[in-house]
Interface confidence: low
């Protein structure tokens, strides 16, 4: 197993309706043909995977589960799109990204993006 | 509906393993994560561990993560937690349930599962 580097943004914060977006940029050594990209979600000292997806270079992601994740992939790039957040939800999301497939095995683990979710405020009653 | 009734909970050495399953019915089983939590007497709900609707990704408590192993058959629509090296602090009612939304969240609050079953005894003996 060799170490990569990953970058991801420190803090994003989601959108109103609980979508929070950011990017995975994975520092290859080689050309890898299949990287799999898995999220982890770190909170209240334990950590637990949001979502994975393995693909083909140039192909889209398709995660597992009728998951709550969606993304595309460029070049060394992953563009993450988390959906359904709640205020409950926040926490550190950390991108973490294998690179399966020609050998070698390589495996890079990101600092975490933090994202706040803030649950929206009901609608006060309007008279038009 | 969906109705979770689990079993395999008794009583077991300190070190010793259990296997506790639960079996479901329900059409909509297989779509939707499940998870374990557990109560202990005189104390609240804990989340145990909870597993992905195709087995694929799972999420454990600190307390128990390296000696529990959460698991499911979908063919037999059941769901299991292989408990090993077990302590006397895992002594509780171990319920089985199913997060009332599809897809993979993990979460740890109860409130976010909405099928429960009964619960099966596991007292683990110093």
């Known amino acids: 197993c060799k170490a990569m580097h990953v970058a991801q943004p420190a803090v994003v914060l989601a959108s109103s309706r609980g979508i929070a977006s950011f990017v995975c940029e994975y520092a290859s050594p080689g050309k890898a043909t299949e990287v799999r990209v898995t999220v982890l979600r770190q909170a209240d000292s334990q950590v637990t995977e949001v979502c994975a997806a393995t693909y083909m270079m140039g192909n889209e992601l398709t995660f597992l589960d009728d998951s709550i994740c969606t993304g595309t992939s460029s070049g060394n790039q992953v563009n993450l799109t988390i959906q359904g957040l709640r205020a409950m939800d926040t926490g550190l999301y950390i991108c973490k990204v294998e690179l399966m497939y020609p050998p070698p095995y390589y495996l890079g683990i990101g600092n975490g993006t933090q994202i706040y979710v803030i649950d929206p405020e009901p609608c006060p009653d309007s008279d038009f | 509906e969906v109705q979770l009734v689990e079993s395999g909970g008794q009583l077991v050495q300190a070190g010793g393993s259990l296997r506790l399953s639960c079996a479901a019915t329900?059409?909509?089983?297989?779509?939707?994560?499940l998870g374990w939590f557990r109560q202990a007497p005189g104390k609240e709900h804990e989340f145990v561990a909870a597993?992905?609707?195709?087995?694929?990704?799972?999420a454990y408590a600190d307390s128990v993560k390296g000696r529990f192993t959460i698991s499911r058959d979908n063919a037999k629509n059941t769901v299991y937690l292989q408990m090993n090296n077990l302590k006397p602090e895992d002594t509780a009612v171990y319920y089985c349930?199913?997060?009332?939304?599809?897809?993979?969240?993990?979460?740890?609050?109860?409130?976010?599962?909405?099928?429960w079953g009964q619960g099966t005894q596991v007292t683990v003996s110093s």
């Open positions: 597993i992905s609707a195709s087995g694929t990704l799972r």
């Open positions: 349930a199913r997060h009332h939304s599809v897809g993979w969240r993990a979460s740890h609050h109860l409130s976010d599962y909405d099928n």
């Open positions: 329900g059409r909509t089983y297989n779509s939707y994560s």
